[in-house]
């Protein structure tokens, strides 16, 4: 008995060939011996089987002695043994229809689990192997699970179902809903305008939800909500914003926040959460603000940074075009009785300058000028 594998929703063509290369009488029946279709001369006739409105043949092939059964929009319950009767012969074809679906939505939040469920006909014992877009292979039976989805899992998953040494391939498009970056750091001099951007790593036609930015200032004992907003069809509208600082928010995606000026009291870490409509869970992006201030008070030139800096960062004070006078893995450095000239305060990581602030030290009889 010939075995044919089909995919739920697809079309399958079961072949039946007569030795005579001409149009003769034929019938396709199901295992209950109920007629699906056949011919009456050059006319196609259909029986009362459940396949009635989804079964067809190719009249153009009848003259060549070919009498296919075409089944459209396959269902799992179409799995059956189909019998073609032609020239006093019976040809049997076993059709096995499989379906593979993501048990939840195919749009999943980063960190969530993906479960792929195989629908299969009773009595079948298929094996499934899926390959993720980043090349990871997973194997299973009726269900396959992948926990902790990552951004790289977005894309087309290719799954192969194997049964009776035959295989059928499914492709499922998975979208992992996440921000492009899990975390970002913004380095700013005191007084500068700060731009926070939260680009999404996916595109969908309609995006609706709500979000909030919570901020933990380094100097504050507790975190506070800086802004709440709504997202409707990719349009952003602010619901509530603190008076200090008074953030501004862009009306379109990507989510964009502007802090009018960087001040030491704002330095710290924020967590932007985005709750999407019809999704359980939230998207998160951490954002950090590091603020630098260079000051000269009497005979003391000081450079300070506030905010989440890593211990390996180096803070230096140097006179322009000269070697650093002071370099420390600390958040404040100073020089007593600095020479006149343009001093640079540098925050660097392995030689790469992250933040720079210049201060002009005048001869001792003058007051300092900050450019």
């Amino acid at each position: 008995k010939k075995v044919v594998l089909g995919k739920k929703g697809d079309t399958v063509e079961l072949t039946c060939t007569a030795s005579q290369k001409k149009s003769i009488q034929f019938h396709w029946k199901n295992s209950n011996q109920i007629k699906i279709l056949g011919n009456q001369g050059s006319f196609l006739t259909k029986g009362p089987s459940k396949l009635n409105d989804r079964a067809d043949s190719r009249r153009s092939l009848w003259d060549q002695g070919n009498f296919p059964l075409i089944i459209k929009n396959l269902k799992i319950e179409d799995s059956d043994t189909y019998i073609c009767e032609v020239e006093d012969q019976k040809e049997e074809v076993q059709l096995l229809v499989f379906g593979l679906t993501a048990n939840s939505d195919t749009h999943l939040l980063q960190g969530q689990s993906l479960t792929l469920t195989l629908e299969s006909p009773p009595g079948s014992s298929p094996s499934v192997q899926c390959r993720s877009p980043r090349g990871k292979n997973i194997q299973g039976g009726k269900t396959l699970s992948v926990s902790q989805l990552e951004l790289q899992d977005s894309g087309t998953w290719t799954c192969t179902v194997l049964q009776n040494q035959k295989k059928v391939e499914f492709k499922i498009d998975i979208v992992v809903l996440a921000f492009q970056k899990a975390s970002s750091i913004v380095y700013k001099k005191e007084g500068e305008q700060v731009e926070f951007s939260f680009p999404l790593a996916f595109t969908v036609e309609k995006l609706t939800g709500s979000g909030e930015l919570w901020w933990q200032a380094e100097r504050a004992s507790s975190s506070k909500s800086w802004i709440t907003f709504d997202l409707k069809n990719k349009e952003v509208s602010v619901k509530r914003v603190t008076q200090d600082p008074k953030l501004q928010m862009g009306k379109k995606l990507p989510l964009h926040l502007t802090l009018p000026q960087a001040l030491p009291q704002y330095a710290g870490s924020g967590n932007l959460t985005l709750a999407l409509e019809a999704k359980t869970g939230k998207l998160h992006q951490e954002v950090n603000l590091v603020v630098m201030r260079a000051t000269q008070l009497q005979k003391n030139l000081t450079c300070e940074v506030w905010g989440p800096t890593s211990p390996k960062l180096m803070l230096s004070l140097k006179l322009e075009n000269k070697e650093a006078k002071v370099s420390k893995r600390e958040k404040a450095v100073w020089v007593l009785n600095p020479e006149a000239g343009m001093w640079q305060c540098l925050l660097s990581d392995s030689g790469q300058v992250l933040l720079e602030s210049n201060i002009k030290v005048l001869p001792t009889w003058s007051t300092p000028v900050q450019p």
């Epitope: 011996q33 109920i34 007629k35 006739t45 029986g47 009362p48 459940k50 409105d53």
Partner: antibody
């Protein structure tokens, strides 16, 4: 066991639409074809058409342009609408279940029938 | 559509008689034929399917035969409760069609 009960107006005016409902009790409506058959007084049986629980239909070509069938699985009901009726549509209307088994295809369960008269 | 022609349209026989009804199809319908019994004021009841197989609970005095285009229905020994109209119905192809019916009466 499964029982069928037709319901609907017994009198319909010419050119109007005849509407009948069949309620299935004692079993599930799912995974069967459900058909409508009519019988004018003193005459034979005419198959009007059938509907599967998925909503797919097959109608008798002689009535196709006037027939609409629908199914409501939540209520275990299926219905028939026949538009632009004339006196020739006066008949007893039956609903029935079509059953397929091995070497078997027949209407094994019938309603008791409801008489519909088309008259002004 | 497949036309089903039944004959006779009516017959009268005595209790205990053998009664035969014929049904002819306009096309070859293999053995895709049912026989129904309809008593006055009642819905039809399926007696025979697949041309010759008795439905469960149907008395063995009823039988069917035939294949292709010609079929017969027989009541071996007519009983008073057999007074009814008998219909053949093909299920080879849609639309499902019935014969015109044979009314069986007792003399």
């Amino acid at each position: 066991q499964v029982q069928l009960q037709e319901s609907g107006p017994g009198l319909v005016k010419p050119s109007e639409t005849l509407s009948l409902t069949c309620t299935v009790s004692g079993g599930s409506i799912s995974s069967f074809y459900w058909s409508w058959i009519r019988q004018p007084a003193g005459k034979g049986l005419e198959w009007i058409g059938r509907i599967y629980t998925s909503g797919s239909t097959n109608y008798n070509p002689s009535l196709k342009s006037r027939v609409t069938m629908s199914v409501d699985t939540s209520k275990n009901q299926f219905s028939l609408k026949l538009s632009s009726v004339t006196a020739a549509d006066t008949a007893v209307y039956y609903c029935a279940r079509e059953l397929e088994k091995r070497n078997y295809y027949g209407m094994d369960v019938w309603g008791q029938g409801t008489t519909v008269t088309v008259s002004s | 559509d497949i036309q089903m022609t039944q004959s006779p349209s009516s017959l009268s026989a005595s209790v205990g008689d053998r009664v035969t009804i014929t049904c002819q199809a306009s096309h070859d319908i293999s053995n895709y034929l049912n026989w129904y019994q309809q008593k006055p004021g009642k819905a039809p009841k399926l007696l025979i399917f697949d041309a010759s197989t008795l439905e469960t609970g149907v008395p063995s005095r009823f039988s069917g035969s035939g294949s292709g285009t010609y079929f017969t229905f027989t009541i071996r020994s007519l009983q008073p409760e057999d007074i009814a109209t008998y219909y053949c119905q093909q299920y080879d192809s849609l639309p499902l069609t019935f014969g015109g019916g044979t009314k069986v009466e007792i003399k």
